[in-house]
């Protein structure tokens, strides 16, 4: 099994290893090298629960497997967000939860993962063969989505066997974006290379020393704009009690909110479908979701200078979540 | 590197408060969960909650919901934990440990907190 | 809440030999082709060590006598060789989802 290093930031070169090529020229193909031969894809999956307790209550489920940051989570029902597709849920990593009934509770299990229970009742309830999907946006790897639904003979309390990588869709302005900056990377790579071809390699220092020769996966960490939140203390106090539905979150409002666009045909719920959001703010870019925050008056988060690698323990796809190293 | 920083020892009656504090360096402190974890004395792990340090929300294990108060201070990069009404099945170690996507690979030294009379 | 039952609750092994270590959901924490189930050691004094997480993955420095398997419901952590320095209690967590829970804890002796 490959295990691999983390590196904080780019440290600069040993004093000897200068020369005539400068530090930037020094590190940028190792930057480049590492996202050349190491860049992966990502994996959403989608789970489908029907509770024994109550038969038409849903629990589903969705996880995010790469190494990029979140910036915004969609659930939706009836098909992919966008294509036809109602949305049930939109949960952000700073500015909290939205979402729409038949949804009950939307929730952060871990920073990479979430789970959405829905209503039974009534004339918007799922029926068994509906079908549910996720979208998780993330910074590089743009937006990625799967779906998952119940298999219509469910026994209840059973679940759908899990979409194993099935990526329904992957939209074109984070493919396009990320495959064109590595081709255009790559191709660099390659004239720096032959250009410094005699030239010693700078050393990068491991936070963690690895026992085999590491094969990672970059990502540069971005944090998110403080500046936007307008936190008015710096010290946070909060009870210890579980998540409510009727939490007001602290920073961010139905401002930011109205500008989503949820393709839902209902309207959205009052005040009880808010709920503060436990994931952190870990680098919230994603070029399609920039729109977002142009319609809330906010600038989009900008990228941080520091580069972390990120092991890899699974074969090609990087499951690390980031780590706002600096 | 990233390292968790926890407080020393407390010594405290019953009925009392204490908190704690747990200082995050080699990170960004608002990017992961803080997670804290209890551990009596020759017994096992319970997980007690998290904050998130951008925006201070906390989620708890049910049966520390009156028990435990979680906050950071962002200035400082400093998670706390507040245990108040304190008894004798307070006393225990308590570990702030740090979340990366789904897992805990980062912990602090731990505090041990002792309720005597 | 998910409850992890851990076995056996304590093990002597033989230097050199094979020590395996069960842990049991209460429901499934797994999902695609990941588990949400971490191992963790911990020695006296010290807090605990990530081994692996996802059930199989070697966390970064870990020497590769550490392995674990499993999906669903069971999974198992297997030190083979066994060395002396592995002697420490050996914990599951699960992050499937709030709260965690974590496995009732292994004791491992070195014979």
């Known amino acids: 099994m490959r295990t691999e290093a983390q590196v904080p930031a780019l440290q600069p070169p040993e004093p000897g290893l200068e020369g005539a090529m400068g530090h930037r020229t020094l590190v940028l193909p190792w930057v480049l090298l590492t996202l050349c031969v190491t860049a992966g894809t990502p994996e959403v999956w989608v789970q489908v629960r029907m509770e024994a307790t109550e038969l038409s209550s849903f629990t589903i489920r969705c996880g995010f497997l790469g190494s990029g940051s979140i910036s915004l989570v969609t659930v939706s029902w009836g098909g992919p967000n966008g294509a036809g597709g109602t949305t049930l849920a939109v949960l952000h990593p700073e500015r909290g939860i939205r979402q729409w009934a038949p949804a009950r509770q939307a929730r952060w299990e871990t920073q990479s993962s979430i789970s959405l229970i829905l209503e039974g009742s009534g004339a918007s309830s799922p029926c068994a063969n509906t079908t549910f999907c996720c979208k998780f946006a993330s910074f590089p790897e743009g937006s990625w989505e799967a779906c998952g639904s119940l298999p219509p003979s469910s026994d209840p309390g059973l679940s759908a066997p899990p979409t194993p990588a099935p990526i329904l869709r992957a939209d074109l302005a984070g493919i396009l974006g990320v495959s064109g900056v590595l081709l255009f990377g790559c191709v660099y790579l390659l004239h720096l290379l032959r250009r410094h071809k005699h030239r010693p390699a700078p050393r990068l220092q491991p936070s963690r020393t690895s026992p085999q020769a590491p094969r990672a996966r970059a990502w540069a960490p971005s944090q998110a704009s403080q500046a936007a939140l307008h936190v008015p203390y710096a010290t946070i106090n909060t009870s210890c009690r579980p998540a409510t539905l009727d939490t007001a979150h602290p920073h961010g409002g139905p401002s930011w909110w109205a500008s989503l666009p949820t393709h839902a045909a209902h309207r959205p719920q009052g005040p009880a479908a808010w709920a503060s959001t436990p994931i952190p703010a870990r680098g919230s870019f994603v070029s399609v979701e920039n729109g977002l925050y142009a319609q809330a008056g906010e600038r989009p988060p900008h990228t941080g200078p520091g580069l972390t690698l990120f092991p890899d323990p699974r074969g090609p796809r990087a499951m690390e979540g980031p780590l706002g190293v600096r | 590197q990233v390292q968790l920083q926890q407080s020393g020892a407390e010594l405290a009656k019953p009925g009392a408060s204490v908190k704690m504090s747990c200082k995050a360096s080699g990170y960004t402190f608002t990017s992961n969960w803080m997670h804290w974890v209890k551990q009596r004395p020759g017994q096992g792990l319970e997980w007690i909650g998290y904050i998130n340090p951008s925006n201070g929300y906390t989620e708890c294990n049910q049966k520390f919901r009156d028990k435990a108060t979680l906050s950071a201070d962002k200035s400082s990069s400093t998670a706390y934990m507040q245990l108040n009404s304190l008894t004798s099945a307070d006393s225990a170690v308590y570990y702030c440990?740090?979340?990366?996507?789904?897992?805990?690979?980062?912990w602090g030294q731990g505090t041990l907190v002792t309720v005597s009379a | 809440d998910i409850v992890l039952t851990q076995s056996p609750a304590s093990l002597a092994i033989s230097l050199g030999q094979r020590a395996t270590i069960s842990c049991r959901a209460s429901q499934s924490v797994s999902a695609s082709s990941y588990s949400y189930v971490h191992w963790y050691q911990q020695k006296p004094g010290q807090p605990p060590k990530l081994l692996i997480k996802y059930a199989s993955s070697l966390e970064s420095g870990v020497p590769a006598r550490f392995s674990g398997s499993g999906s669903g419901t069971d999974f198992t952590l297997n030190i083979h060789p066994v060395e002396e320095e592995d002697t420490a209690t050996y914990y599951c967590?699960?992050?499937?989802?709030?709260?965690?829970?974590f496995g009732g804890g292994t004791k491992l002796e070195i014979k």
């Open positions: 967590l699960h992050t499937w989802e709030i709260p965690y829970t």
């Open positions: 440990a740090l979340m990366i996507s789904a897992w805990l690979p980062y």
